[in-house]
C-alpha cells in the first residue's frame, strides 16, 4: 500500500480468483483514543471500533472511504484504491491501446518543434468518475523538470456502438535548447483512477523523434506563362524551429486528381517551390519533415488546380 | 527516404555536400545495424545512448547559431577550446567562433574514426561474421575531415590485447551509430547554417 | 472453491458451427478475464482467444481470427466460445482458463472436426 | 507458430535431479514472467510455476523454477516416478499480451 495523495491509498492486488488479497492497516488521524467507531462509504454499519482498523483487501468491494467517527462526529478519511497486476502484468483497463506506432501505445505524444513543448494524449471509453494526473521528468534516474498543465478532454468521437474520448495534456521542459542533442529521454507519466480503480502509463521518447512539423504555410500556385505548368510556393510554418538555416524542412509536393485510385505525382525538394504540371480538378499537396533527422511527415497542406 | 540529391555548386559552402553524404552513410549503417543486429539490444529505445566525445570536445555549443546564443539553456556549458583554421572557410568569412566550431566538428570525426576502425577490427575477428563497419562510411568521414584540413595530432588506433567479447562489440556498435547519427545530424545542420550565412 | 465446467464438445463437418460454454462458479466471475486454450491430439498447447472481465477487449490467434468468437453472460457466470467454419486443423480439445498469476482450468471437452 | 523453445525430450532416474530449459526472446521471456506446466495424460495442465521462480501452495518444493534473461528453466530435484508428464513454460509477448505463448512442451521420462 502507498499514499497517492493525501488521505488516498494504493493497494497493489495479485488479481486472480480467490486470491488472498492484501491485509491493510487502517490508523485514525486523531489524538483521540476511545469512541471511535469505522464506516466504509455511505453505509452506516460499523466495521470495527478503535483507533485501528485491520482489514483484508481482495476486492473492489472492499476498495472505497473509510471513515472513523466519534460521537457521530467524523475525525477522518481514507480513500482505498485498488491497483491490479493481473500474471505480474499491471492492469491496463482504463485506457484504450491506440495501437500506433506499435502495440500496446497507451500515450502518445507529438511536439512541433524543438523548443522543448510537447503534447500527449490518451483515448478511453470511459465518461464519468474518472480523473488524470501528469507527471513529467528529463531522465529518471536524476530528473530535470518539465511541466505539464492538466489533462482535459480534448474530443468526442463516435466509433460503432462506442463513445471515445480523447484527453490531452501540454507539456514544457524547463530548460530547453532547440540545438541540443538528448541523450536522455523525456519520461511521461499518467495516473489514471477510474472510480476505485487505479492506473498508471508511462511514455519514454525524445523530442527529436515525436517531431511533426505543422503544414507549410500560405501554399500558393503561379501558372507559368504558356504551359500547363504551375510554379508552387508555400514557407515554413509559423510554429517551426528558428533560424530555418540551421532547423531545415524538406517538403513533398504531390499532385492528387479527384479519384483516389488515380496515380499521384510526387517531388520531393528542400526548397521552397517546386514547378509541376496541374490536371484538371486535381488538387496540389505539399507536407514536411526535418530534413536531416527522419521524424513525422506534417499533415498535408492542399490547394486546388483550378 | 529517397531525396534527389542535390549536387553544389563550386562556390558553394565545400564542406555541405560531404555532411550530406555522412549523414546518408550512417543512417544508412544504423539501418543495416538494427536489421542485421535483430536479435541484440540495438534500437533507440534499448541502448544507452553514450557520447564518446563528452566532455572532450564541444560541437553542439562553438557551432550554436547567433540566433540561439540568447536563449540561456544553450549556454550552459559553453567551453570552447579550438583556435585553428580549416579550408572549409572563405578566407574572408574566417572568424573565431566559425574556426572554434569546425574545429570541433573535425575532432569529433576524429575520435568517431578510431572508435570505428578499432571496432571493425575486433568485428573482423567474429567467427560469425555477422556485421561489418561499411566502408563507404568510413570514406565519407575520410572525405569531410580531409575538407574540414584541420592539422591535429593523430590519434594512435586503440588495439586490444583481449579476446574481444563479441556480443558487446556488436551492442558498443549500435550505441556508437546512434551517437554517430545524432552528431552527423548537428553536423549537417551546422554545414546548412554556414552556407546560409 | 473455483470451478470451471465446460460442455459444447462433439463431432461436426468441416464448415459447420459448434459453441462450447464454460460455466463459472465459486468466485466473482465479472472481475476476471478469461482465456480459451486448446490442444490438439498428441500436440502442444495453443491459446485461442482471451475476453476482458467486462467483455470490452477480445484477443484472438491468428489461426482463428474471423471464425471463432469469445463472449461472456456476466449475468450467468459463463464464457462462450463460439467456433464457425470449423476445419480438421481445429479438431482438439478445448480449455478454459482464468486470467491470473494463479490460473483455474476446465476439465476440457473435445472438438472432433471431421466428415 | 510456437516462439518459445523447448527440448522434446528429458529423461532421469528417481533421486536425479533433471532441468528442462525454455528459449525465448527480448520481447517475451525478457520482458515478461514465466509460468509453468504440468500436463499428466488426459488431465488438463496443473500450475508448478508462476512469477519465474514462485510456487503455489500444493507443490512440491523439489520444483523450482528461475529465469536469466531470455531463457528460464525448470527444475526437479529428487525426480520421482509420479512426475512422469509434458511440462509447458508459458510466457507473454509485449506486443500481443494478453495472448498466452506456451513453449513446444517436453516429455519427462523417469527410467527404471
Known amino acids: 500500500i502507498w499514499e497517492l495523495k493525501k488521505d488516498v491509498y494504493v493497494v497493489e492486488l495479485d488479481w486472480y480468483p480467490d486470491a488472498p488479497g492484501e491485509m491493510v492497516v487502517l490508523t485514525c488521524d486523531t489524538p483521540e483514543e476511545d469512541g471511535i467507531t469505522w464506516t466504509l462509504d455511505q453505509s452506516s454499519e460499523v466495521l470495527g471500533s478503535g483507533k485501528t482498523l485491520t482489514i483484508q483487501v481482495k476486492e473492489f468491494g472492499d476498495a472505497g472511504q473509510y471513515t472513523c467517527h466519534k460521537g457521530g462526529e467524523v475525525l477522518s478519511h481514507s480513500l482505498l484504491l485498488l491497483h491490479k497486476k493481473e500474471d505480474g502484468i499491471w492492469s491496463t483497463d482504463i485506457l484504450k491501446d491506440q495501437k500506433e506506432p506499435k502495440n500496446k501505445t497507451f500515450l502518445r505524444c507529438e511536439a512541433k518543434n524543438y523548443s522543448g513543448r510537447f503534447t500527449c494524449w490518451w483515448l478511453t471509453t470511459i465518461s464519468t468518475d474518472l480523473t488524470f494526473s501528469v507527471k513529467s521528468s528529463r531522465g529518471s534516474s536524476d530528473p530535470q523538470g518539465v511541466t505539464c498543465g492538466a489533462a482535459t478532454l480534448s474530443a468526442e468521437r463516435v466509433r460503432g456502438d462506442n463513445k471515445e474520448y480523447e484527453y490531452s495534456v501540454e507539456c514544457q521542459e524547463d530548460s530547453a535548447c532547440p540545438a541540443a542533442e538528448e541523450s536522455l529521454p523525456i519520461e511521461v507519466m499518467v495516473d489514471a483512477v477510474h472510480k476505485l480503480k487505479y492506473e498508471n502509463y508511462t511514455s519514454s521518447f525524445f523530442i527529436r523523434d515525436i517531431i511533426k512539423p505543422d503544414p507549410p504555410k500560405n501554399l500558393q500556385l503561379k501558372p507559368l506563362k504558356n504551359s500547363r505548368q504551375v510554379e508552387v510556393s508555400w514557407e515554413y510554418p509559423d510554429t517551426w524551429s528558428t533560424p530555418h538555416s540551421y532547423f531545415s524542412l524538406t517538403f513533398c509536393v504531390q499532385v492528387q486528381g479527384k479519384s483516389k485510385r488515380e496515380k499521384k505525382d510526387r517531388v520531393f525538394t528542400d526548397k521552397t517551390s517546386a514547378t509541376v504540371i496541374c490536371r484538371k480538378n486535381a488538387s496540389i499537396s505539399v507536407r514536411a519533415q526535418d530534413r536531416y533527422y527522419s521524424s513525422s511527415w506534417s499533415e498535408w497542406a492542399s490547394v486546388p488546380c483550378s | 527516404r529517397n531525396l534527389p540529391v542535390a549536387t553544389p555548386d563550386p562556390g558553394m559552402f565545400p564542406c555541405l555536400h560531404h555532411s550530406q553524404n555522412l549523414l546518408r552513410a550512417v543512417s544508412n549503417m544504423l539501418q543495416k545495424a538494427r536489421q542485421t543486429l535483430e536479435f541484440y539490444p540495438c534500437t533507440s529505445e534499448e541502448i544507452d545512448h553514450e557520447d564518446i566525445t563528452k566532455d572532450k570536445t564541444s560541437t553542439v555549443e562553438a557551432c550554436l547559431p547567433l540566433e540561439l546564443t540568447k536563449n540561456e539553456s544553450c549556454l550552459n556549458s559553453r567551453e570552447t577550446s579550438f583556435i585553428t583554421n580549416g579550408s572549409c572557410l572563405a578566407s574572408r568569412k574566417t572568424s573565431f567562433m566559425m574556426a572554434l566550431c569546425l574545429s570541433s566538428i573535425y575532432e569529433d570525426l576524429k575520435m568517431y574514426q578510431v572508435e570505428f576502425k578499432t571496432m571493425n577490427a575486433k568485428l573482423l575477428m567474429d567467427p560469425k561474421r555477422q556485421i561489418f563497419l561499411d566502408q563507404n562510411m568510413l570514406a565519407v568521414i575520410d572525405e569531410l575531415m580531409q575538407a574540414l584540413n584541420f592539422n591535429s595530432e593523430t590519434v594512435p588506433q586503440k588495439s586490444s590485447l583481449e579476446e574481444p567479447d563479441f556480443y558487446k562489440t556488436k551492442i558498443k556498435l549500435c550505441i556508437l551509430l546512434h551517437a554517430f547519427r545524432i552528431r552527423a545530424v548537428t553536423i549537417d545542420r551546422v554545414m546548412s547554417y554556414l552556407n546560409a550565412s | 472453491q473455483v470451478q470451471l465446467v465446460q460442455s459444447g464438445g462433439g463431432v461436426v463437418q468441416p464448415g459447420r458451427s459448434l459453441r462450447l460454454s464454460c460455466a463459472a462458479s465459486?468466485?466473482?466471475?465479472?472481475?476476471?478475464?478469461m482465456h480459451w486454450v486448446r490442444q490438439a491430439p498428441g500436440k502442444g498447447l495453443e491459446w485461442v482467444a482471451f475476453?476482458?472481465?467486462?467483455?470490452?477487449?477480445?484477443y484472438y490467434a491468428d489461426s482463428v481470427k474471423g471464425r471463432f468468437t469469445i463472449s461472456r453472460d456476466n449475468s450467468k457466470n459463463t464464457l462462450y466460445l463460439q467456433m464457425k467454419s470449423l476445419r480438421a486443423e481445429d479438431t482438439a480439445v478445448y480449455y478454459c482458463?482464468?486470467?491470473?498469476?494463479?490460473?483455474?482450468w476446465g476439465q476440457g471437452t473435445m472438438v472432433t472436426v471431421s466428415s | 507458430s510456437y516462439v518459445l523453445t523447448q527440448p522434446p525430450s528429458v529423461s532421469g532416474t528417481p533421486g536425479q535431479r533433471v532441468t528442462i530449459s525454455c528459449s525465448g526472446g527480448?520481447?517475451?521471456?525478457?520482458?515478461?514472467?514465466v509460468k509453468w506446466y504440468q500436463q499428466l495424460p488426459g488431465t488438463a495442465p496443473k500450475l508448478l510455476i508462476y512469477?519465474?521462480?514462485q510456487r503455489p501452495s500444493g507443490v512440491p518444493d523439489r520444483f523450482s523454477g528461475s529465469k536469466s534473461g531470455t531463457s528460464a528453466s525448470l527444475a526437479i530435484t529428487g525426480v520421482q516416478a509420479e512426475d512422469e508428464a509434458d511440462y509447458y513454460c508459458?510466457?507473454?509477448?509485449?506486443?500481443?499480451?494478453?495472448?498466452?505463448?506456451f513453449g513446444t512442451g517436453t516429455k519427462l521420462t523417469v527410467l527404471g
Open positions: 508459458q510466457s507473454y509477448d509485449r506486443g500481443t499480451h494478453p495472448a498466452l505463448l
Open positions: 465459486g468466485f466473482t466471475f465479472s472481475s476476471y478475464g
Open positions: 475476453i476482458r472481465y467486462d467483455g470490452s477487449n477480445k
Open positions: 527480448r520481447s517475451n521471456i525478457g520482458s515478461n514472467t
Open positions: 482458463k482464468t486470467h491470473g498469476s494463479h490460473d483455474n
Open positions: 512469477g519465474n521462480d
